[in-house]
Interface confidence: low
C-alpha cells in the first residue's frame, strides 16, 4: 500500500525511539568513520524532519523516498572526501545508484580501535548521567564495526544492554553482576553479526533464489508440522525482510519484521506448537525468540519420500510443470524429516536431485535413470558426518587452544597467501566449533557444526574479497555457496606457494607479552605459529609442536625473570636460532 510520505509512515509505524535508533544504525553502518556527535546531529535532523511530515504529509520533500532523504543527509557531511576518499563520489550519483554505491563501500574490516571496556563504576555513572546518550553510543559503536548487523536485532541487544546496566548498577557487587552479562552480549553479538553477514552474502552474491532455498530448508526443519504453502509464505516474507536489511533499508526491514512476527503469532496453529512462549513477549524480544525457536516435533506419520520423488512415473512431468516449486517441495519434505542434517547438506542433496532430474528427464527411460537417485545421496551425507566425527575426536583429545592450533596449521598450509591476522581470526573461530557443537547429542552435531562453519568461512570470504590474494580462496568462495565448506576441506598443501623469507623481527618478543590477558597471549603465539608455517609450509606436526613448546617455555621463563626485558633480549635470539635449526 502506498503512502504519501514514506518517512511519516515509518515514523508512525515504528515510533520515535525505534525510528531514531534505526536511523542511527543505518548512518553508522554507511559512514563508519564519522564521530558519534556528527551522527547524533544527523539523526536529530532527520527525526525533526520526519515529525514535520507526520504533521503534514504534503509538506515539502516529505514525498521523497527514504534513500533520497537519507542519502541527501549523508552527503551533507563536510569531511566526506577527506575521511572516505572515493566514497564521496557516490554523492554525485542519483538514486538508486547512489545507495548501491554506499553499499559497495561498506567496510567489513574497518580500521577502528578495539573497544576498551572502562571500569564498572565509570560505566554505571555514565549510564545514570545520560542513559539515552549511553545507549546511542552502544548502537553507534556496534553498527560501525559491523556494517551488516541485523538492525532490528541490534535494537534488541541495546535493550538487553540497558537492562543489564539498570539491574547491575544497583547491585552490591556491580562488577560480578555486570561483566558476565556484557561478555555474553559481546559474544552473542559477534555471532549474530556473522550469521547475518552470511545471509547478506547469500542474497548479494548468489541471489534471492539461494536465500529462499536456505530459508525453505531451515524453516522446514523448525516447523515440520506446517504445510508447504505456509512455509513458502514465511520464506517469501523472511526474504523480503533480509533483502531490505542487507540493502540498507532498515526502517522497512524492522517494520516488515514486526509484521512477520505478528503474522506468526496470529497463525501459530498452522506453524508450530513452540511459538506460544515467544508470542507473549514484547516486540523486540518476540522477534528474537521466534528467530531462535527450537524445532517442533516431527509429525509421527510422515510417509517415505521415495513414493513421490523416485517411484512415481510423474516425476519428470511434475518437475517440468514448475521446476522451482517441485524442487522447493522436495527440499521441504526432506528437511522436515531431517533436523539431524545441516542446512547446507540439505541444499546439496536438493542440488544433486535437481542435477539428476535435468539429466534423466531428457533420457530415453527417465524412470530407470533416476531410480537410484537416493543412493547417490549417501556419500554426500557421509562426508560431513565423518568430518564432524573426526574433528570432534581431535577437539576432545587436544582441547580448544591446541585444536585451534591444528586448524591454524591446516588452513595456513591450504591458503598461505591469506594475511596472518585473517588466518588467526578465522582459525580461532573455526576452532570454537568444538566447544559449541561437540558436546551436543549426535542428532544435533552436524547441523550445529557445518552451519557454524559456513558462517565462519563466509567471514574469510568477505575479508578475502576486500583484498584478494589467493585464487583457491576466490574459487571456493564464489563457485557455490553450498559447497564452500567441502571446497575448503578438500584443499591440500599449496605446492605452488613460495615460502616466506624468514624475518627475525616477526619472532622478536618483549616484556609486554607478560602483561597480556590469556586470550591475547594465545593470539600472539598463534600469530607466530602461522608465520612459522608460512616460512616452512612442509614442517611436520612434530617439528611445529617442538617449536611452540619451546616458545611457551621461553615466554614463561622470561615472564618469571626479575629483568624481563633483558631476558627477552637475551633468550629471544637463542629461541629464534633453535627454531630455525629445528625446522631446517
Amino acid at each position: 500500500d502506498t503512502h504519501k510520505s514514506e518517512v511519516a509512515h515509518r515514523f508512525k509505524d515504528l515510533g520515535e525511539e525505534h525510528f531514531k535508533g534505526l536511523v542511527l544504525v543505518a548512518f553508522s553502518q554507511y559512514l563508519q568513520q564519522c564521530p558519534f556527535e556528527e551522527h547524533v546531529k544527523l539523526v536529530n535532523e532527520v527525526t525533526e524532519f520526519a515529525k514535520t511530515c507526520v504533521a503534514d504529509e504534503s509538506a515539502e520533500n516529505c514525498d521523497k523516498s527514504l534513500h533520497t532523504l537519507f542519502g541527501d543527509k549523508l552527503c551533507t557531511v563536510a569531511t566526506l572526501r577527506e575521511t572516505y576518499g572515493e566514497m564521496a563520489d557516490c554523492c554525485a550519483k542519483q538514486e538508486p545508484e547512489r545507495n548501491e554505491c554506499f553499499l559497495q563501500h561498506k567496510d567489513d574490516n574497518p580500521n577502528l580501535p578495539p573497544l576498551v571496556r572502562p571500569e564498572v563504576d565509570v560505566m554505571c555513572t555514565a549510564f545514570h548521567d545520560n542513559e539515552a546518550t549511553f545507549l546511542k553510543k552502544y548502537l553507534y559503536e556496534v553498527a560501525r564495526r559491523h556494517p551488516y548487523f541485523y538492525a532490528p536485532e541490534l535494537l534488541f541487544f541495546a535493550a538487553r544492554y540497558k537492562a543489564a546496566f539498570a539491574e547491575c548498577c544497583q547491585a552490591a557487587d556491580k562488577a560480578a553482576c555486570l561483566l558476565p552479562k556484557l561478555d555474553e552480549l559481546r559474544d552473542e553479538g559477534k555471532a549474530s553479526s556473522a550469521k547475518q553477514r552470511l545471509k547478506c552474502a547469500s542474497l548479494q552474491k548468489f541471489g534471492d533464489r539461494a536465500f529462499k532455498a536456505w530459508a525453505v530448508a531451515r524453516l522446514s526443519q523448525k516447523f515440520p508440522k506446517a504445510e508447504f504453502a505456509e512455509v513458502s509464505k514465511l520464506v517469501t516474507d523472511l526474504t523480503k525482510v533480509h533483502t531490505e536489511c542487507c540493502h540498507g533499508d532498515l526502517l522497512e526491514c524492522a517494520d516488515d519484521r514486526a509484521d512477520l512476527a505478528k503474522y506468526m503469532c496470529e497463525n501459530q496453529d498452522s506453524i508450530s506448537s513452540k511459538l506460544k512462549e515467544c508470542c507473549d513477549k514484547p516486540l523486540l524480544e518476540k522477534s528474537h525468540c521466534l528467530a531462535e525457536v527450537e524445532n517442533d516435533e516431527m509429525p509421527a506419520d510422515l510417509p517415505s519420500l521415495a513414493a513421490d520423488y523416485v517411484e512415481s512415473k510423474d516425476v519428470c512431468k511434475n518437475y517440468a510443470e514448475a521446476k522451482d516449486v517441485f524442487l522447493g517441495m522436495f527440499l521441504y519434505e526432506y528437511a522436515r524429516r531431517h533436523p539431524d542434517y545441516s542446512v547446507m547438506l540439505l541444499l546439496r542433496l536438493a542440488k544433486a536431485y535437481e542435477a539428476t532430474l535435468e539429466k534423466c528427464c531428457a533420457a530415453a527411460d527417465p524412470h530407470e535413470c533416476y531410480a537410484k537417485v537416493f543412493d547417490e545421496f549417501q556419500p554426500l551425507v557421509e562426508e560431513p558426518q565423518n568430518l564432524v566425527k573426526q574433528n570432534c575426536e581431535l577437539f576432545e583429545q587436544l582441547g580448544e587452544y591446541k585444536f585451534q592450533n591444528a586448524l591454524l596449521v591446516r588452513y595456513t598450509k591450504k591458503v598461505p597467501q591469506v594475511s596472518t591476522p585473517t588466518l588467526v581470526e578465522v582459525s580461532r573461530n573455526l576452532g570454537k566449533v568444538g566447544a559449541k557443537c561437540c558436546k551436543l547429542p549426535e542428532a544435533k552435531r552436524m547441523p550445529c557444526a557445518e552451519d557454524y562453519l559456513s558462517v565462519v568461512l563466509n567471514r574469510l570470504c568477505v575479508l578475502h574479497e576486500k583484498t584478494p590474494v589467493s585464487e583457491k580462496v576466490t574459487k571456493c568462495c564464489t563457485e557455490s555457496l553450498v559447497n564452500r565448506r567441502p571446497c575448503f576441506s578438500a584443499l591440500e598443501l599449496d605446492e605452488a606457494y613460495v615460502p616466506k623469507a624468514f624475518n627475525a623481527e616477526t619472532f622478536t618478543f618483549h616484556a609486554d607479552m607478560c602483561t597480556l590477558s590469556e586470550k591475547e597471549k594465545q593470539v600472539k603465539k598463534q600469530t607466530a605459529l602461522v608465520e612459522l608455517v608460512k616460512h616452512k609450509p612442509k614442517a611436520t606436526k612434530e617439528q611445529l609442536k617442538g617449536v611452540m613448546d619451546n616458545f611457551a617455555a621461553f615466554v614463561e621463563k622470561c615472564c618469571k625473570a626479575d629483568d624481563k626485558e633483558a631476558c627477552f633480549a637475551e633468550e629471544g635470539p637463542k629461541f629464534v636460532a633453535a627454531s630455525q635449526a629445528a625446522l631446517a
Partner: nanobody
Framework: QVQLVESGGGLVQPGGSLRLSCAAS????????MAWYRQAPGQQREFVAR???????NYPDSVKGRFTISRDNAKNTVYLQMNSLRAEDTAVYYC?????????WGQGTLVTVSS
Amino acid sequence: QVQLVESGGGLVQPGGSLRLSCAASGSIESINRMAWYRQAPGQQREFVARISKGGSTNYPDSVKGRFTISRDNAKNTVYLQMNSLRAEDTAVYYCAAGPVWEQFWGQGTLVTVSS
C-alpha cells in the same frame, strides 16, 4: 587521542586544603565529561567527582561538601578543590575524560594527608 596532565598534589595536614589541576590537550573537541578518581595503596580505584561540559557536577557521599570540581573550558582545564582533608583521602588522584564515559586517563598525582 587526548592527553591529560595532573598537578598540585603534595603533603598536607589533616583539616588542610589542596587544589589539583588537570590540563587536557589533543582531540579535546569530543570531550564532554571530565572527572577525578583516586586510588589508595591496595585499594580499588574510586570515583571522586565529575563535571560535564555544561557544568553539571556529581560526587560520592564520601567527599560531598568537602570537594568541589570546576572546569575552565577556555583553558581545557579541570580543577579539584579539596577542603577539610582527612588521612583516608591519601591516594594517587587521577584525572579522566571522555565523550560519553572517561576513557582517557592521566598519570596521577600523589596526595598525602598526614600530621
